[in-house]
């Protein structure tokens, strides 16, 4: 059995030429006639050179999940998905997302330090001594406050709470 | 003598249509596919289009597709090329093109001139 | 689509000497390729099918050879009929069909 060259796909104990992408095997080759190929029906693709006697159908973005499209389906090009804002890709093959997951809100004592894409989940980072963040969108942490000199420090502030200061 | 004659070239405004004619004799015309194909001045050839030997199938190059049409009268021996919407970069020397080893192109036409200029 | 480079774009040689002419694919098209010469103000002319195959009225001086993605036309002794623009075209994997841009074989 013959080993076909790359981008050749075999048929019985011959190679014929493989397809364009966009196109699918219409009749394979023969002595006189190469590989015959129609272009593929709506809805359906090939992305690559193939041997294939029927186009791959399109994908379908499922809202449920999360997907929005990104990128309608053409005749060499399967359709891109996208996570719907707030949302990010959990399970990435190439340029094919399956299922999203929610943004992390980032807790009490962090801080935004990278906010999500809809390929990415949200980087949160600690606050440092001597500020506080109530968590949530908060990309800055905020310095405690000063008490005054007519006030009085009742509790010290934390990563996720501020100073609290009463009047004498 | 197997034979292919095309004609209704001419000078043509950009988006103004014209129809080629490619009279066959010789051959039995009904049993072989046809093409068309072109060479811009001074430029290689390009295949624009080919028709099946009962015009059931059509193929078009990117180039053309949308904008040109191919058909075939079998009874009358000849083929057709309706080509609209033409632009400067379709200049070209048309010729139609077939032959006993298709898809390879064994007989062709003399050629007819398109040009596409204001 | 398959791309057809022809190379060298133009060829000064001698009535009498042998030329090579070449042909590369973008990817393989097996042996589904063929040959064409043409003059100035005539339509191109069938020399080779089915990569090394003699179209019928040809003569055997020229000859063809090559499959996957690398093909050859090679002129034995060159007659001065034979100084002509060269092309091959790919019929493995259409449409479309497509052609090289040319080699240009002139006297030197």
């Known amino acids: 059995q013959p080993s076909c060259r790359q981008e050749e796909f075999l048929v019985g104990d011959e190679c014929c030429p493989m397809c364009n992408p966009g196109y699918h095997v219409k009749q394979v080759c023969s002595e006189h006639t190469g590989t015959v190929c129609a272009p593929c029906p709506p809805q359906t693709y090939t992305a690559h050179a193939n041997g294939l006697s029927k186009c791959l159908p399109c994908g379908v973005c499922d809202p449920d999940m999360g997907l929005l499209t990104w990128q309608e389906c053409s005749s060499w090009k399967d359709t891109v998905c996208r996570c719907i804002p707030g949302y990010f890709c959990e399970n990435q093959d190439g340029s094919h997302c399956s299922t999203c997951l929610q943004h992390t809100t980032c807790p009490p004592g962090q801080r935004v330090e990278k906010r999500g894409t809809h390929d990415q989940d949200t980087v949160c980072a600690d606050c440092l001594t001597g500020t506080f963040s109530l968590g949530g969108t908060q990309e800055e942490c905020l310095p405690w406050t000063n008490c005054s000199a007519f006030q009085q420090e009742v509790r010290r502030g934390t990563n996720s709470t501020d100073t609290t200061c009463s009047s004498q | 003598e197997v034979q292919l004659l095309e004609s209704g070239g001419g000078l043509v405004q950009p988006g103004g249509s014209l129809r080629l004619s490619c009279a066959a004799s010789g051959f039995t015309f009904s049993n072989y596919a046809i093409h068309w194909v072109r060479q811009a001045p001074g430029k290689g050839l390009e295949w624009v289009s080919t028709i099946s030997s009962p015009g059931s199938t059509i193929n078009y190059a990117d180039s053309v597709k949308g904008r040109f049409t191919i058909s075939r009268d079998n009874s009358k021996n000849t083929l057709y090329l309706q080509m609209n919407s033409l632009r400067a970069e379709d200049t070209a020397v048309y010729y139609c093109?077939?032959?006993?080893?298709?898809?390879?192109?064994?007989?062709w036409g003399q050629g007819t001139l398109v040009t596409v200029s204001s | 689509e398959i791309v057809l480079t022809q190379s060298p774009g133009t060829l000064s040689l001698s009535p009498g000497e042998r030329a090579t002419l070449s042909c590369r694919a973008s990817r393989s098209v097996g042996k589904y390729l063929s040959w064409y010469q043409q003059k100035p103000g005539q339509a191109p002319r069938l020399l080779i099918y089915?990569?090394?195959k003699l179209q019928s009225g040809i003569p055997d001086r020229f000859s063809g050879s090559g499959s996957g993605t690398d093909f050859t036309l090679t002129i034995s002794r060159l007659e001065p009929e034979d100084f002509a623009v060269y092309y091959c075209q790919q019929y493995g994997s259409w449409p479309p069909f497509t052609f090289g841009q040319g080699t240009k074989v002139e006297i030197k």
């Open positions: 093109a077939s032959g006993y080893l298709y898809p390879a192109m064994d007989v």
């Open positions: 089915g990569a090394s």
